[in-house]
């Protein structure tokens, strides 16, 4: 992940920049949340461990018609080395637990801020 092409990016983006931009977008989503995010859609919870970017994308890609998270979906695809499509699931999903998109975003944001603080950009 040393050459991440961010959304509308003119060229390769350092991992630290890509992660910071993802955090900025998640902050923006939580800040501007007036009505229930994505009409209260539910997604599979994930284990926030190695491979979580693909797992997060696999969860969020199943939410359709929600413009608020489209940029996040595109950004996450830059962190995931393989193509992700709707209906795809990895072992990182907690398959018996569904949570609201808003909670999913909050949990992901909290974890990414921790990674950023610790310098874990990949």
């Amino acid at each position: 992940l040393t050459c991440l092409g961010g959304f509308a990016s003119p060229g390769p983006v350092p991992p630290s920049t890509a992660l910071r931009e993802l955090i900025e977008e998640l902050v923006n989503i939580t800040q501007n949340q007036k009505a229930p995010l994505c009409n209260g859609s539910m997604v599979w919870s994930i284990n926030l461990t190695a491979g979580m970017y693909c797992a997060a994308l696999e969860s969020l890609i199943n939410v359709s018609g929600c413009s608020a998270i489209e940029k996040t979906q595109r950004m996450l695809s830059g962190f995931c080395p393989h193509k992700v499509s709707a209906g795809q699931f990895s072992s990182l999903h907690v398959r018996d637990t569904k949570i609201e998109v808003a909670q999913f975003v909050k949990d992901l944001l909290l974890h990414l801020k921790k990674l950023f603080r610790e310098g874990q950009f990949n």
């Epitope: 910071r20 902050v27 801020k113 950023f116 603080r117």
Partner: antibody
Framework: EVQLVESGGGLVKPGGSLRLSCAAS????????MNWVRQAPGKGLEWVSY????????YYADSVKGRFTISRDNAKNSLYLQMNSLRAEDTAVYYC??????????????WGQGTMVTVSS | DIQMTQSPSSLSASVGDRVTFTCRAS??????LGWYQQKPGKAPKRLIY???SLQSGVPSRFSGSGSGTEFTLTISSLQPEDFATYYC?????????FGPGTKVDIR
């Protein structure tokens, strides 16, 4: 040396305008979100505005929304605050402070020395 | 908006005293909190980041603790240069908010 230096303060009449600048040096300015914070004479600190690294996300305190505009020029390592429709209650020392989306050890770690804005007729 | 309250608002202490300030947030801010020292006519100086991490170059007599909604700043042995006003800042969500400050003066 990591440094932020504000300028542009002064005396202005109510309803007037002023543009503050903050010149950054000693660090990669484009990698940091930036903020303006103010302090009225004898009062506490009040956050004014935030701008993300690439200008994508901007936030304001309710007290200045619609009157103040934050901007940055990464090529010039500079942060700006355009202040319009100034009121007496905007009288304060204005500081710029660097940040990294509240995510890191760099959040609000470096501050400028401040520039005084006085709004009075 | 997240409200920050600080107690006490002021305190008188002597050199060598152990002093503790409290900062409370109106909602959970995880550890997105910093502590700042400000002396008259000067810019704030950060002492603690991420609620409990000591800023580089800051003496070890300063320490921070807490997470969620309740936070403390402790000076283990007050020095003459520590007489100042101390502010907490939450940078968890916008608008960022400062506590009203705690002024420490000489008893």
């Amino acid at each position: 040396e990591v440094q932020l230096v504000e300028s542009g303060g002064g005396l202005v009449k109510p309803g007037g305008s002023l543009r503050l600048s903050c010149a950054a040096s000693g660090f990669t300015f484009s990698s940091y979100s930036m903020n303006w914070v103010r302090q009225a004479p004898g009062k506490g600190l009040e956050w004014v505005s935030y701008i993300s690294t690439s200008n994508s996300y901007i936030y304001y305190a309710d007290s200045v929304k619609g009157r103040f505009t934050i901007s940055r020029d990464n090529a010039k390592n500079s942060l700006y605050l355009q202040m319009n429709s100034l009121r007496a209650e905007d009288t304060a020392v204005y500081y710029c402070a660097r940040d990294q989306v509240g995510a890191t050890l760099d959040a609000f770690d470096i501050w400028g020395q401040g520039t005084m804005v006085t709004v009075s007729s | 908006d997240i409200q920050m309250t600080q107690s006490p608002s002021s305190l008188s202490a002597s050199v060598g005293d152990r002093v503790t300030f409290t900062c409370r947030a109106s909602q959970d801010i995880t550890d997105d909190l910093g502590w700042y020292q400000q002396k008259p006519g000067k810019a704030p100086k950060r002492l603690i980041y991420a609620a409990s991490s000591l800023q580089s170059g800051v003496p070890s007599r300063f320490s921070g603790s807490g997470s969620g909604t309740e936070f403390t700043l402790t000076i283990s042995s007050l020095q003459p240069e520590d007489f100042a006003t101390y502010y907490c800042l939450q940078h968890n969500s916008y608008p960022f908010t400062f506590g009203p400050g705690t002024k420490v003066d000489i008893r």
